[in-house]
């Protein structure tokens, strides 16, 4: 059955980020995950990040150099933004950004969170807090071992998500992430918005940016 | 309830100096960025740099060392300040920020 | 710096049809776009935000979609008041840049 996974907070205060280990999903087909740029709280300095879906070996040196593939970037203090990334078996045109079972995906920011870091290419909270989240798609949570894991890139959307259409398994080598320090995102139903939508919040806003 | 008000002159010589002040009201400027557009008669948007919450400033480089923005947060004022101007700068300029913008102030530069 | 286009540059349509305008980003921008609408004499107005999130008090009607480079504004049933020109804007990096506009006109 499809789920909307536990949404995941784009925070250096999240603690699934604080443990110092990467953050570990597991998604099915049909599964929605919200990527959440939280909007800024009173006394708190606002958060400046750029979330890129990498290649497994961007996300082991903490490097968005090399053709990086931008998702969504959190610059708008007034209000919350919400990425939503869909995980569908088909891709609804050529554009589409195709996830294929049983492999490893990756997603983090080479930001360090201040406004003049943002465009930060190398590093950033990707090396300082492992805020990284890394997607195992159709994969088992009990059953799986890095030798199992072969990885790919996908190619870019052009929809309001990520829609990400799997399909059978390539054989690119056995890149998945072999550290074994990952937080892991149970699987439960949320309620909530599971929006469609790249992104929503309140108040909505246009402006807050750089 | 969030609101922004721009003021400054209609006209302006050629060469000289634009100063609009936007004053703002509802929010803090230390949460929202404030940001400056403009439209020449009849054509669209553009946008020329914004003031982010922290204090920093960014600017769009087609308006090279020309253009400086400031604020004085106890007064809730940002500040454009556009020297040489020429012709071409005759536009509308608005400040905004996430869903409201100011009703603009009509600038002519005239020789 | 970010050129985005939009197209076609103006269009006629009839009370309740339906039209779709087009912004498409020099590179790649993730979600980080906005349209806005703009009527005659006034100052622009947040549609869609994020892309494809409907401002509040923003009508169904109105409908954002895309990412990476290919964006849309759709807009369903159109309303006599929804005469104006309407703006594409990316503001992922610096310099944040507008489309140059859409004009919508009503037979």
């Known amino acids: 059955l499809a789920k909307n996974l536990e949404p995941v907070s784009w925070s250096s205060l999240n603690p699934k980020f604080l443990s110092g280990k990467g953050l570990v999903i597991y998604p099915k087909i049909g599964d929605k995950l919200d990527i959440i740029c939280p909007r800024a709280e009173a006394g708190r300095p606002y958060e400046y990040y750029k979330l890129y879906l990498v290649r497994p070996e961007q996300a082991a040196a903490c490097s968005t150099v090399l053709d990086p593939n931008v998702l969504v970037t959190c610059n708008r203090p007034e209000q919350e933004i919400r990425f939503t990334i869909k995980f569908q078996e088909f891709s609804p045109n050529y554009m589409g950004l195709e996830f294929k079972k049983h492999h490893d995906y990756y997603i983090t920011s080479t930001s360090n969170g201040s406004l003049e870091g943002l465009e930060n290419r190398e590093g950033g909270v990707c090396r300082t807090r492992t805020m990284k989240i890394i997607m195992k798609v159709g994969q088992d949570p009990n059953a799986v071992t890095p030798e199992q894991l072969t990885t790919s890139r996908p190619s870019k959307e052009a929809d309001n998500t990520v829609k990400m259409a799997t399909q059978a398994p390539g054989s690119r080598g056995s890149l998945g992430d072999s550290d074994g320090k990952h937080e892991t995102v149970n699987q439960e139903e949320k309620s909530g918005p599971g929006a469609s939508g790249g992104s929503s919040g309140d108040p909505d806003g246009f402006f807050n940016s750089k | 309830q969030v609101q922004l008000k721009e003021t400054g002159p209609d006209l302006v010589h050629l060469t000289q100096t634009l100063s609009i002040t936007c004053t703002v009201s509802?929010?803090?400027?230390?949460?929202?960025?404030i940001h400056w557009v403009r439209q020449p008669p009849g054509k669209g948007l553009e946008w020329m740099g914004a003031m982010w919450n922290g204090g920093g400033t960014d600017y769009n480089s087609a308006f090279k060392s020309r253009l400086s923005i400031s604020r004085d947060t106890s007064k809730s004022q940002v500040f454009l300040k556009m020297n040489s101007l020429q012709t071409d700068d005759t536009a509308k300029y608005f400040c905004a920020t996430p869903t409201d913008w100011g009703q603009g102030v009509m600038v002519t530069v005239s020789s | 710096e970010t050129v985005m286009t939009q197209s076609p540059t103006s269009m006629s349509t009839s009370i309740g049809e339906r039209v779709t305008l087009n912004c498409k980003a020099s590179?790649?921008?993730?979600?980080?776009v906005d349209w806005y609408q703009q009527t005659p004499g006034q100052s622009p107005k947040l549609l869609i935000y994020g892309a494809s999130s409907r401002h509040t008090g923003v009508p169904d009607r109105f409908t954002g979609s895309g990412f990476g480079r290919d964006f849309t504004l759709t807009i369903t049933n159109v309303e006599a008041e929804d005469l104006a020109v309407y703006y594409c804007?990316?503001?992922?990096?610096?310099?944040?840049?507008f489309g140059s506009g859409t004009r919508l006109e009503i037979k």
């Open positions: 590179q790649s921008v993730g979600i980080n």
């Open positions: 804007l990316h503001y992922g990096s610096i310099p944040f840049t």
């Open positions: 509802g929010f803090s400027l230390t949460t929202y960025n």
